[in-house]
Interface confidence: low
């Protein structure tokens, strides 16, 4: 998979974004940055610019390495993909932002609001929050 009409080898987009709750937990899947391995022949390994906080598995799923409260300090980092044979390297920016919190007042106003504001993350069309199938 890749850019517009053409699966150019690399990341399908220049920037990936995820909206998260304030508290990020160790092992929590955050988003997917699947590399566009167009012809299927490339063996790519991923690397995070902030390895103490984020790791990437072989499917391009980004996980939290530890538990921490999300802050501007963690809001932007890079993911690198490197071709194991040619050593070609690509990078993509990841932006994390906080999910808006509900005030007590708005919760009182609508008992259903939590259902609306906090849908399940892994729905069919949740884009990068979907695990790749083999």
């Amino acid at each position: 998979s890749g850019e517009i009409a053409l699966c150019k080898t690399g990341f399908p987009e220049d920037v990936y974004s995820a909206v998260l709750s304030k508290d990020v937990h160790e092992g929590q899947p955050l988003l997917n940055v699947k590399f566009s391995n167009c012809n299927g022949k490339r063996k790519v390994q991923y690397e995070s610019s902030e390895p103490a906080d984020f790791k990437v598995d072989e499917d391009g799923m980004v996980y939290a390495v530890r538990s921490f409260p999300l802050s501007s300090e963690h809001a932007k980092f890079l993911i690198y993909a490197q071709d194991k044979e040619t050593q070609e390297k690509w990078q993509v920016a990841v932006k994390l932002s906080l999910k808006p919190t509900l005030t007590e007042e708005s919760v009182k106003e609508s008992a259903e609001v939590e259902e609306i504001v906090f849908p399940r993350q892994f729905s069919k069309h949740s884009g990068h929050l979907q695990r790749q199938k083999r």
Epitope: S1, G2, I4, A5, L6, P12, V15, K34, C38
Partner: antibody, heavy 115, light 106 residues
Framework: QVQLVQSGAEVKKPGASVQVSCKAS????????MHWLRQAPGQGLEWMGY????????KYNEKFKGRVTMTSDTSISTAYMELSSLRSDDTAVYYC????????WGQATLVTVSS | ELVLTQSPGTLSLSPGERATLSCRAS?????MYWYQQKPGQAPRLLIY???NLAPGIPDRFSGSGSGTDFTLTISSLQPEDAATYYC?????????FGQGTKLEIK
Amino acid sequence: QVQLVQSGAEVKKPGASVQVSCKASGYTFTSYLMHWLRQAPGQGLEWMGYINPYIDVTKYNEKFKGRVTMTSDTSISTAYMELSSLRSDDTAVYYCAGGDYEDYWGQATLVTVSS
Amino acid sequence: ELVLTQSPGTLSLSPGERATLSCRASSSVNYMYWYQQKPGQAPRLLIYYTSNLAPGIPDRFSGSGSGTDFTLTISSLQPEDAATYYCQQFSSPPFTFGQGTKLEIK
């Protein structure tokens, strides 16, 4: 060689829907995104969205959200784009596009919306 | 929506001359992509990731730039380069195109 073959020209009335198909051959269909773009007569290019057949995920241009649906049938390596509630300004040439570097595009499908 | 503005709208040059096409983004983008489209044909990718030449594209084409200002250069124009050229960004959905620069060869 890689080929993307689109369905034929369509003439539709305002308010109707149109479905354009795009059959891929010469590569592994699930290895690529399939994008849909359009170009109104004498105008520039407009990106409508894409489908990732590998994980069945779509991303749409907000302008078309609610009117466009992109699907794929991996068993026959075919992608589909359906646009509903057609208006006269939807008259355009529609392209599917995918591929690796070489930049593969379908041959285009003209959709005319006219009462 | 991120807006890409191309200039000039039309460029008329002679074979052998150098063509410089500009694309300005309304806010910063990471990369720019350039396409060539001839009448009645689908677009063709020329440049990806700002400066990488797509396979099969002659090396008289080159791309440069960063941030909000990007350039497509054709070093020595050939008659077959007459076409409309579009820039496109993938940094911010929707993935918008510029309005195009029509290149005429005298």
